[in-house]
Amino acid sequence: KLLQVSTIAMQQQEKLIQQERALLNFTEWKRSCALQMKYCQAFMQNSLSSAHNSSPCPNNWIQNRESCYYVSEIWSIWHTSQENCLKEGSTLLQIESKEEMDFITGSLRKIKGSYDYWVGLSQDGHSGRWLWQDGSSPSPGLLPAERSQSANQVCGYVKSNSLLSSNCSTWKYFICEKYALRSSV
């Protein structure tokens, strides 16, 4: 009789352990669901607010036609500047026209004044040709005014209303560019 009671007690204890395990799993699952719910709500809120604002450019970016521009507040070398832009889903500024150049230099005058800003222009070491980072050549009116005498790699930057060249390892501000979001309306 005592053995029977002891066996029943052990079975009950085993059941209790299983139930505790199930409860623990359920709590974990519930926590995971709550976390996912929170994430989904945040995502929905972001989507709705961005749809409501229908802003073609992110906060702190400037819009001009189909482009958004970000003027950095930190200095970095050219290659690090490129990395910083890529992290934002953008590339270093690529100036396609005199109109775009005028907009950029005008905006810089308002924001910061006469500093140096890296753009996505670099000189091919083999040919000495200037190329934008997508591989295209700048239009004749948008070539850096001075040839840098650096033995190192040479990159382009904007200062005041000029396009100039410098050793890519010098520290400057930089400008990123991405396409503006098109309104679906």
């Epitope: 992290k87 953008s90 590339t91 997508d134 591989g135 991405k178």
Partner: nanobody, 121 residues
């Protein structure tokens, strides 16, 4: 777990071509840019080519006109077509994603394990 899986490396003669491919095997909240970097022995890792989520492209100066990057958002892959290969292109090529992880809020760099490209006769 593996997040970025490269394929397509190997030995090729100067002037030859190779195509590298990279597949993303993990979910991200968003991928801002994907691309390829390379590292030759004794040298720093350098950008070869990158493409942003908006389709903007950046190439390393030394590969312009020879390499072409493309991205398939539906398959979450990024390819690098390498033509007119030179001995100085010899390096380990790494796939990279600049992405915001699920439940994250900041962009992080994710790297593949690398694939060797050797250009030699």
């Amino acid at each position: 777990q593996v997040q970025l899986q490269e394929s397509g490396g190997g030995l090729v003669q100067p002037g030859g071509s190779l195509r590298l491919s990279c597949a993303v095997s993990r979910n991200f909240f968003s991928i801002n840019a994907m691309g390829w970097y390379r590292q030759a022995p004794g040298k720093q890792r350098e950008l070869v080519a990158a493409i942003t989520n908006g389709g903007r492209i950046a190439y390393g100066t030394s590969v312009m006109g020879r390499f072409t990057i493309s991205r398939d958002d539906a398959k979450n892959t990024v390819d690098l077509q390498m033509n007119s290969l030179r001995p100085e292109d010899t390096a380990v090529y790494y796939c990279n994603a600049k992405a915001i992880p699920v439940y994250g809020s900041t962009v992080e760099d994710y790297w593949g394990q690398g694939t060797q490209v050797t250009v030699s006769s």
